[in-house]
């Protein structure tokens, strides 16, 4: 299921980097969130629950990330013009069933004021 544009602020700039916010419903207990740049997987984070409700967080493509009860934030640093692209949050829901995949995204515009280490 492709939902198109995120209906929230997906990109938060700070210190020459960007926080990309991937939201999900707080009812979701087990999932995989991938950050795509165009069609390429940049980062992923998988949250699963084992016996006794022990939570496991795994990443196959590791980025600096932050997990809350309704979002995963991925952090990209040292921005330059090559970072300008479409970015998508690809959410795969395992629990609650049934399995669902949903894609939301937006275009990351890079302006001079947001670049790292600008030459004065």
């Amino acid at each position: 299921e492709i939902n198109g544009s995120a209906n929230y602020e997906m990109f938060i700039f700070h210190n020459g980097g960007v926080q990309i916010l991937c939201k999900y419903p707080d009812i979701v207990q087990q999932f995989k969130m991938q950050l795509l740049k165009g069609g390429q997987i940049l980062c992923d984070l998988t949250k699963t629950k084992g016996s006794g409700n022990t939570v496991s967080i795994k990443s196959l493509k590791f980025c600096h990330s932050q997990l809350s009860n309704n979002s995963v934030s991925f952090f990209l640093y040292n921005l330059d013009h090559s970072h300008a692209n479409y970015y998508f949050c690809n959410l795969s829901i395992f629990d609650p069933p049934p399995f669902k995949v949903t894609l939301t995204g937006g275009y990351l515009h890079i302006y001079e004021s947001q670049l790292c280490c600008q030459l004065k």
């Epitope: 299921e1 939902n3 939201k23 609650p96």
Partner: antibody, heavy 125, light 108 residues
Framework: EVQLVESGGGLVQPGGSLRLSCAAS????????MHWVRQVTGKGLEWVSA???????YYSDSVKGRFTISRENAKNSLYLQMNSLRDGDTAVYFC???????????????????WGQGTTVTVSS | EVVLTQSPATLSLSPGERATLSCRAS??????LAWFQQKPGQAPRLLIY???NRATGIPARFSGSGSGTDFTLTISSLEPEDFAVYYC??????????FGQGTRLEIK
């Protein structure tokens, strides 16, 4: 008119097999998660099995390992292969569909809004 | 497994009266509850989803409320065609999907 039509029910001996079918029309079958729900005469509703839009399958403990659910989106069809049938499987079997939509932080469940008329399965020697 | 307990088992009322049916869940299911009506020899019909949303084509006299573990289906003024069996159902903590045992609404 949106409809589901079940077929394949009948009389079968304990240990036997049946294959139920459910044909859908007038709605976008591929967007629905599909279920089989059964009802013993005069009793309540019992969920049997489900298959998601991605083909993921789910079963009640009472039929796990004996029943297999499948779907063929190109034919707008749902199936339930029932093996090793028992007396306790005697019931009217309904196929039904529901939808879950995820948008950002919202998780919408729209309920089982399409149902077939049911097909009767009788397991008896 | 989420157990749904409906009460009363049978409700005897007259046309024009108000009917209040209850469904209690054994654990928090938020608002992921549906209500169905079933008449003899027919398939169930979805009345309410998401605890309080009327399904397409359902008359305004049917309303649902509640969240968490306690839910209510209200029929504001009973019509003759409303006498049937009513089931609640959850599909958030599953498998299995579970139904309540049903409330039979009969004419007094």
């Amino acid at each position: 008119e949106v409809q589901l039509v079940e077929s394949g029910g009948g009389l079968v001996q304990p240990g036997g097999s049946l294959r139920l079918s459910c044909a859908a029309s007038e709605f976008i079958f591929s967007t629905y998660d599909m279920h089989w729900v059964r009802q013993v005469t005069g009793k309540g509703l019992e969920w049997v099995s489900a298959i998601g839009t991605a083909g993921d399958t789910y079963y009640s403990d009472s039929v796990k390992g004996r029943f297999t659910i499948s779907r063929e989106n190109a034919k707008n069809s749902l199936y339930l292969q029932m093996n090793s049938l028992r007396d306790g499987d005697t019931a009217v079997y309904f196929c039904t569909g529901d939808r879950t939509v995820v948008r950002g932080v919202n998780y919408y469940y729209y309920g089982m809004d399409v149902w077939g008329q049911g097909t009767t399965v009788t397991v008896s020697s | 497994e989420v157990v749904l307990t409906q009460s009363p088992a049978t409700l005897s009322l007259s046309p024009g009266e108000r009917a209040t049916l209850s469904c209690r869940a054994s654990q928090n299911i938020r608002n992921y509850l549906a209500w169905f009506q079933q008449k003899p020899g027919q398939a169930p019909r979805l009345l309410i989803y998401g605890a309080s949303n009327r399904a397409t084509g359902i008359p305004a006299r049917f309303s649902g409320s509640g969240s968490g573990t306690d839910f209510t289906l209200t029929i504001s003024s009973l019509e003759p065609e409303d006498f049937a069996v009513y089931y609640c159902q959850q599909r958030i903590n599953w498998p299995p999907i579970t139904f309540g045992q049903g409330t039979r609404l009969e004419i007094k």
